[in-house]
């Protein structure tokens, strides 16, 4: 059974992940982002179901394309400059949260999503899990 300290740790990690995802979303929605139109053409895979921490496998699998789409917007006028580090940090948190004991085969929805829809989906996921922990 999860202890209060492990629950607290999970909550903190989810909050960190939530902040990172929100930071990316705010960055790409920045009016100074000249590549937003282009970024919105990329199709991301969305989870069919995302209600448990193990479903973060579906986010992990899309982190590389997310990094490469975000790379498009790296410029002095756009503040998401250390994309690689940011994605790497997210990856570390995701691996810790989902656990590595069981490798889940991610099930994706038939419909793909834009980067904005994709980020919003995972932001909602974090908020939902956090609310069950508090």
């Amino acid at each position: 059974a999860p202890t209060s300290s492990s629950t607290k740790k999970t909550q903190l990690q989810l909050e960190h992940l939530l902040l990172d995802l929100q930071m990316i979303l705010n960055g790409i929605n920045n009016y100074k982002n000249p590549k937003l139109t282009r970024m919105l053409t990329f199709k991301f895979y969305m989870p069919k179901k995302a209600t448990e921490l193990r479903h973060l496998q579906c986010l992990e699998e899309e982190l590389k394309p997310l990094e490469e789409v975000l790379n498009l917007a790296q410029s002095k006028s756009f503040h998401l400059r250390d994309t690689k580090d940011l994605i790497s940090n997210i990856n570390v948190i995701v691996l810790e949260l989902k656990g590595s004991e069981t490798t889940l085969m991610c099930e994706y929805a038939d419909e793909t999503a834009t980067i904005v829809e994709f980020l919003n989906r995972w932001i909602t996921f974090c908020q939902s899990i956090i609310s069950t922990l508090t």
Epitope: T41, K43, C106
Partner: antibody, heavy 118, light 107 residues
């Protein structure tokens, strides 16, 4: 880490068929297309076609239409390219490459040399 | 089908030189162009995608520019390991098509 490992070199007679495999690891096989590209000795790169491992959908260059078949086995994360009615000018190194929309071909197999000789 | 024309087909340069390779598309391909480096006996390696974006791990001396039908790959200061053949690839529509290649040799 992402890897595409291809089958070994083949020697075939004119008129025969060859089937090259490309085993993917280190990523979700169905999330990326597999493209096939060939290169004759001392020549440039030539795109042959693509396959979406998720749907099985394919698209072939006009030059290879009717002679090439691209398939996959998702249970073993492997893509295949079969070229039939081989002729000497099909002697080349055949590469598989992973691609997704406008990200280009980010990972390539090591190449498979196919020699067509009587 | 879209034709990709690369120039020059070969180029001699010295370590430290600035080098530019051009690729021209037969029709508008927006920013849907990649650049690849190939060394003898090896598979090609992606250097640039979406005309100007560097994947992680590619040295910053490589840069890409252009859109529509005219594209360039620039190596700001040639290093010994950069002597290779370079190809452009349009990933705007099917069939995909490569340029004929530019062989970069040591002067």
């Amino acid at each position: 880490q992402v890897q595409l490992v291809q089958s070994g070199a083949e020697v075939k007679k004119p008129g025969a068929s060859v089937k090259v495999s490309c085993k993917a690891s280190g990523y979700t096989f169905t999330n990326y297309d597999i493209n096939w590209v060939r290169q004759a000795t001392g020549q440039g790169l030539e795109w042959m076609g693509w396959m979406n491992p998720n749907s099985g959908n394919t698209g072939y260059a006009q030059k290879f239409q009717g002679r090439v078949t691209m398939t996959r086995n998702t249970s073993i994360n492997t893509a295949y390219m079969e070229l039939s009615s081989l002729r000497s000018e099909d002697t080349a190194v055949y590469y598989c490459a992973r691609g997704r929309q406008w990200l280009g071909f980010d990972y390539w197999g090591q190449g498979t040399l196919v020699t067509v000789s009587s | 089908d879209i034709q990709m024309t690369q120039s020059p087909s070969s180029l001699s340069a010295s370590v430290g030189d600035r080098v530019t390779i051009t690729c021209r598309a037969s029709q508008d391909i927006e920013h849907d162009l990649g650049w690849y480096q190939q060394k003898p006996g090896k598979a090609p390696k992606r250097l640039i995608y979406a005309a100007s974006t560097l994947p992680s791990g590619v040295p910053s001396r490589f840069s890409g520019s252009g859109s529509g039908t005219e594209f360039t790959l620039t190596i700001s200061s040639l290093q010994p390991e950069d002597f290779a053949t370079y190809y452009c690839l349009q990933h705007n529509s099917f069939p995909r098509s490569f340029g004929q290649g530019t062989q970069l040799e040591i002067k």
